[in-house]
């Protein structure tokens, strides 16, 4: 932005500048160019010997300027266009300035003036141009500063040229008021801070409803000596509840929200929220819907899931496999987990209690993501009730629970766990174990064995202990062995059928289990 302090051309000849000597030399004249009247200060004393004609401007108030720019538009006639070349003719003139705190009026003293430069034309007006009224206009610009007084004069010294000043414009430069990155930068005088620092750093202020981002830099711009803004640093962002519209921050429309200062626009309220008011920073959930603490505000509100579907409990001796399917209503969330709880009841007394301590789960029962689990170490002749609860990220925000139950009666002991302890060419030593909690119920153990491939005959041995040695066996022969607990109520669960092989007559101490 240029702030004009003096514009001779714009004044249409109304500026009465001082000429020295008075009545000689410089003269204000009017001409017609492009059918418009133009004014100029002109002098053409090219045949009168040495000249020293001065033209001084009126006093110019400096305002805020430190450096001023002087733009001159002028024409100079070719000395050769005059008869005999006009021996004292020159083709340059001198530009001067003087600072002062007061207007000296008509008191003109050359010694107060400091020369800025000799002004020479790039193009002179030759005879043919003059005759054809082609004005060869020259434009020269000079900078003066720093200025310190209240005002100044310019002066033009003619030393014998044929020159016309058509325009004298004095201005200083400002970086204009500017909006950039939602920051307002004030109109700033273009000054060099120093020779090494030609840019002035200017802090901007965020527009209404804009803020400097947390941990970010405030807005800064640099004003150059040429009055141009450069190198923006930092920025402002529209605060929560507001979005950027051109160079301003506008409140989010009803039904929209913005939760933080960012470059993002306002977002539409998500599903299962109530319509927001203007300038909303979030949208409230509908009744019965919730937001988990970690849920982004842009996410739909959700609710706890319904109970799991189709819970089944399949008894396998002293084990139960629980299977279920996902809830019909997930509540709009993907983070569903399941919890399994266990209750046992004694048939004789009808007494019930929790059984988490006495049973074993195939995986921890409180954050299951799969839809099945196996429960073992169940006691025989006991009624068990299993509850499977479906939970999601908002279940903790309500008191109600979503679960399904399944009951199972355990009539058998858990099958014994059998292993081969020792063997020889004619014998197999077998041991087994059952849970301690079930041992008191066992009366005896029944060991059934037969040669593999012989379906017609088998042998049975009973014992009260946890091991047995089977003798009189054939060498290098595979036997099928099963152990079953016998209780007062009848047979318990049988172990799986194991294959054990006697040693060959060649002998080998190695055991194959």
């Amino acid at each position: 932005k240029e702030v004009v302090l003096l514009d001779f051309a714009a004044m249409k000849g109304e500026l009465g500048w001082l000429t020295h000597p008075y009545g000689k030399g410089w003269d204000l004249m009017q001409n017609i160019m492009d059918d418009m009247p133009i004014y100029m200060y002109s002098v053409c004393n090219v045949v009168s010997g040495d000249q020293d004609n001065w033209l001084r401007t009126n006093w110019v108030y400096r305002e805020e300027a430190e450096r001023i720019f002087i733009e001159l538009k002028f024409t100079v006639r070719d000395c050769n266009s005059f008869p005999g070349g006009a021996s004292s003719c020159k083709e340059t003139f001198n530009l001067y300035y003087a600072e002062s705190d007061v207007d000296y009026g008509t008191n003109f003293q050359k010694r107060q003036f400091t020369k800025i430069d000799t002004i020479a034309p790039d193009e002179i007006t030759v005879s043919s141009d003059f005759e054809a009224r082609n004005v060869k206009l020259n434009v020269e610009e000079r900078m003066v500063g720093p200025l310190t007084r209240k005002g100044f004069y310019l002066a033009f010294q003619d030393i014998g040229a044929c020159v016309a000043l058509l325009s004298v414009r004095v201005y200083y430069k400002k970086c204009p008021e500017m909006l950039q990155s939602l920051a307002r930068f004030p109109e700033t005088i273009a000054v060099a801070v120093s020779d090494t620092q030609p840019l002035a750093t200017v802090a901007g202020t965020c527009v209404d409803h804009a803020v400097v981002p947390y941990g970010g830099e405030g807005p800064l711009m640099h004003c150059t000596v040429d009055g141009e803004w450069l190198v923006p640093i930092g920025q402002c962002l529209c605060q929560e509840g507001y979005e950027k519209v051109e160079d301003a921050c506008r409140a989010c429309s009803p039904g929209f929200f913005k939760s933080e200062a960012s470059e993002s626009p306002c977002l539409e309220c998500p599903e299962h929220t109530l319509p927001s008011t203007e300038g909303a920073t979030s949208c409230q959930c509908e009744e019965g819907y919730f937001r988990a603490p970690e849920d982004p505000l842009s996410m739909s509100c959700t609710r706890p899931p319904s109970a799991p579907n189709y819970l089944t409990a399949i008894g396998m001796g002293a084990k139960v496999e629980l299977r279920w399917t996902a809830p019909k209503d997930t509540g709009g969330r993907q983070d569903i987990v399941y919890s399994v709880t266990c209750e046992q009841c004694w048939p004789e007394s009808g007494e019930c209690g929790p059984c988490e301590a006495s049973v074993r789960y195939s995986e921890p029962p409180h954050a299951l993501t799969r839809t099945s689990v196996t429960v073992s170490d169940l006691e025989p002749h006991m009624n068990y009730t299993f509850a499977v609860e479906a939970r999601n990220g908002v279940s903790g925000l309500v008191t109600s629970r979503s679960f399904r139950t399944a009951s199972v009666s355990i009539n058998q002991t858990e099958p014994p766990k059998v292993r081969l302890e020792d063997r020889s060419t004619t014998s197999l030593s077998v041991t087994w174990s059952i849970p301690v909690s079930q041992q008191s119920r066992v009366w005896k153990y029944e060991v059934t064995y037969r040669k593999k491939g012989d379906a017609n005959s088998y042998n049975v041995r009973r014992t009260e202990g946890f091991s047995v040695t089977l003798d009189d066996l054939a060498p290098d022969t595979t036997y099928l062995v099963q152990v079953q607990a016998l209780t007062q109520e009848g047979q318990g669960a049988g172990s799986k059928v194991h294959e054990f092989q006697t040693l060959s007559t060649e002998g080998s101490a190695n055991m194959a289990v």
Epitope: I32, V76, F82, S128, E131, R133
Partner: antibody, heavy 128, light 107 residues
């Protein structure tokens, strides 16, 4: 010394034609703007027409526009005025006049010209 | 067209007198004005151009002034050779118009 010598004047009937000539000497003719100025008997001066140094542009007073034609031959240092459809009010002494910008000590030429040098004139009488 | 009006139309003066002739333009012509002298039966002669500039060879007793619409020609110390008719001419517009003339006669 600058000299301008007009010829071609005389008596002519209304509606008739006449061609005036102006022979120039003592200066570089091709540098000069040339003009015709007339003066009716006992009256003031009236500008008639002008022509630029190299033959253009040309200008005419409203009173003669379309009837008179100004021209020059720089090789012969001669200015001409062809006058057609002559009227009684065209009766006057016709002066050839010249202007040399080199002798005009101004930085910017005036919108038009004044006349630095004049011939002695030639009388044109339009009468029946 | 720009009209040029001279006054007076004629004047009588004696040798040595200071004589001033005025010329008024119907609109501003800046300083684009010339003055001519014409003696009976002779061609006009240029005296002043650009309102105040003396033409080469013209005696310094002749001077011109003015700008805009009001101009004057002054002869300070009238000489016998100066008795003639004086014309002003504007050259602001292409229709270069003359004043009607001022005749300076011997008193």
């Amino acid at each position: 010394e600058v000299q301008l010598l007009e010829s071609g004047g005389g008596l002519v009937q209304p509606g008739g034609s006449l061609r005036l000539s102006c022979a120039a000497s003592g200066f570089t003719f091709s540098h000069y703007m040339m003009a015709w100025v007339r003066q009716a008997p006992g009256k003031g001066l009236e500008w008639v027409s002008r022509i630029g140094p190299s033959g253009g542009p040309t200008h005419y007073a409203d009173s003669v526009k379309g009837r008179f034609t100004i021209s020059r031959d720089n090789s012969k240092n001669t200015l001409y005025l062809q006058m057609n459809s002559l009227r009684a009010e065209d009766t006057a002494v016709y002066y050839c006049a010249g202007y040399d910008s080199g002798y005009d000590y101004v930085a910017v030429a005036g919108p038009a010209e004044y006349f630095q040098h004049w011939g002695q004139g030639t009388l044109v009488t339009v009468s029946s | 067209d720009i009209q040029m009006t001279q006054s007076p139309s004629s004047l009588s003066a004696s040798v040595g007198d200071r004589v001033t002739i005025t010329c008024r333009a119907s609109q501003s012509i800046s300083t684009w004005l010339a003055w001519y002298q014409q003696k009976p039966g002779k061609a006009p002669k240029l005296l002043i151009y650009k309102a105040s500039n003396l033409h080469t060879g013209v005696p310094s007793r002749f001077s011109g002034s003015g700008s805009g619409t009001e101009f004057s020609l002054t002869i300070s110390g009238l000489q016998p050779d100066d008795f003639a008719t004086y014309y002003c001419q504007q050259y602001q517009s292409y229709s270069r118009t003359f004043g009607q003339g001022t005749k300076v006669e011997i008193k």
